[in-house]
């Protein structure tokens, strides 16, 4: 069910539109949904989820992660800062679900509706921000090369690389979802 | 199984520092979504919100103590520590530790500690 | 920072009973409302998250209502073990916030 239209939703027909705020809440919820869908099919079809070996791939990737620098975090948050960690991640995290899209077989569906919540959330995000010019867009040719490179990898890897940009998605949406719920 | 287990001294005197140690099992506090918190309950009274600290160590306090509130994880050995400084009588509570994870952070308490009585 | 109101501070009833209490919140949160039970002695015990989820092995006649600031707790076939003190939660955002306890006797 997109995010807005839940059966709570149409048994309230007096409730208040949804807030920006709530928007964005929903939005992320919805996608962390999908997240949990494809983990599951992932870690059923490999034993990636109980591997140590992460570390051989994690250097094949730079996958955005929150730190207390990005304004975040309880010390030193900073909303504007924050917005634009948030927004930039996301960007960079696209040519990372780009690549999951042919990677799963029962959850193709869950695999675009994931890619496609999160250009919505993006969108949604941008309207809240203030400062656009400090979102650096990701180069369109560093991306199609990066993808090349991780489509070309052997088969444990390109496991190893699915469970991973999953897992940190999830991470960095819970940040994301935790930081926003305090602006 | 979940658990979690406060311990630390059960008299303090004016002034002193209270560190409480939680030492807990069956989850790890490096998984994304998990925290844990302290929540204190003076005799007969309501439950009172102290800290909270995350898997990714961002930290959170109450504004009425954040002044004498430090919380601290090691995920090595499974515990959370929370120190409070300049004790009073009015701090007499039992203090617990409780664990929260969920994939949408409600920051919903699914287990506790037993608790332990700081008079 | 957000406050959580509960009403009635005591009630009391029989077994067997149905009864409800309710827990406002001065904002809205959404549905980031939690509650829980707490026996003399004991520790509190998650009962609902997210205003309306059951937690897992509580007893299907607890059930959680309610979102944005007005949120219920409905109790239907009181057991003798039902007594004790009900606390909703707000989960929203920092710092959180109990409410003051619904004190149940029955």
């Known amino acids: 069910v997109p995010p807005g239209e839940d059966s709570k939703d149409v048994a309230a027909p007096h409730r208040q539109p949804l807030t920006s705020s709530e928007r964005i809440d929903k939005q992320i919820r919805y996608i962390l949904d999908g997240i949990s869908a494809l983990r599951k099919e992932t870690c059923n079809k490999s034993n990636m989820c109980e591997s140590s070996k992460e570390a051989l791939a994690e250097n094949n990737l730079n996958l955005p992660k929150m730190a207390e620098k990005d304004g975040c975090f309880q010390s030193g948050f900073n909303e504007e800062t924050c917005l634009v960690k948030i927004i930039t991640g996301l960007l960079e995290f696209e040519v990372y679900l780009e690549y999951l899209q042919n990677r799963f077989e029962s959850s193709e569906e869950q695999a675009r509706a994931v890619q496609m919540s999160t250009k919505v959330l993006i969108q949604f995000l941008q309207k809240k921000a203030k400062n656009l010019d400090a979102i650096t867009t990701p180069d369109p040719t560093t991306n199609a090369s990066l993808l090349t490179k991780l489509q070309a990898q052997n088969q444990w890897l390109q496991d190893m690389t699915t469970h991973l940009i999953l897992r940190s998605f999830k991470e960095f949406l819970q940040s994301s979802l935790r930081a926003l719920r305090q602006m | 199984q979940v658990t979690l287990k406060e311990s630390g001294p059960t008299l303090v005197k004016p002034t002193q520092t209270l560190t409480l140690t939680c030492s807990f099992s069956?989850?790890?506090?490096?998984?994304?979504?998990?925290?844990v918190g302290w929540v204190r309950q003076p005799p007969g009274k309501a439950l009172e919100w102290l800290a909270f600290?995350?898997?990714?160590?961002?930290?959170y306090y109450s504004p009425s103590l954040e002044s004498r509130l430090t919380i601290t994880k090691d995920t090595s050995k499974n515990q959370v520590v929370l120190t409070m400084t300049n004790m009073d009588p009015v701090d007499t509570a039992t203090y617990y530790c409780?664990?929260?994870?969920?994939?949408?952070?409600?920051?919903?308490?699914?287990?506790w500690g037993q608790g332990t009585l700081v008079t | 920072d957000i406050q959580m109101t509960q009403s009635p501070s005591s009630l009391s009833a029989f077994v067997g009973d149905g009864v409800t209490m309710t827990c406002w919140a001065s904002?809205?949160?959404?549905?980031?409302l939690n509650w829980y039970h707490q026996r003399p002695g004991e520790a509190p015990e998650l009962l609902v998250f997210?205003?309306?989820n059951l937690q897992i092995g509580v007893p299907s006649r607890f059930r959680g209502s309610g979102s944005e600031t007005y949120f219920t707790l409905t109790i239907n076939s009181l057991q003798p073990e039902d007594s004790g003190t009900y606390f909703c939660?707000?989960?929203?955002?920092?710092?959180?916030?109990f409410g003051g306890g619904t004190k149940l006797e029955i």
């Open positions: 409780a664990r929260s994870a969920d994939d949408y952070l409600y920051y919903s308490f699914d287990t």
């Open positions: 069956g989850f790890s506090l490096s998984t994304s979504g998990v925290g």
């Open positions: 600290i995350f898997w990714d160590d961002d930290k």
């Open positions: 904002q809205s949160i959404n549905d980031y």
């Open positions: 997210a205003a309306s």
């Open positions: 939660q707000s989960g929203h955002s920092f710092p959180l916030t």
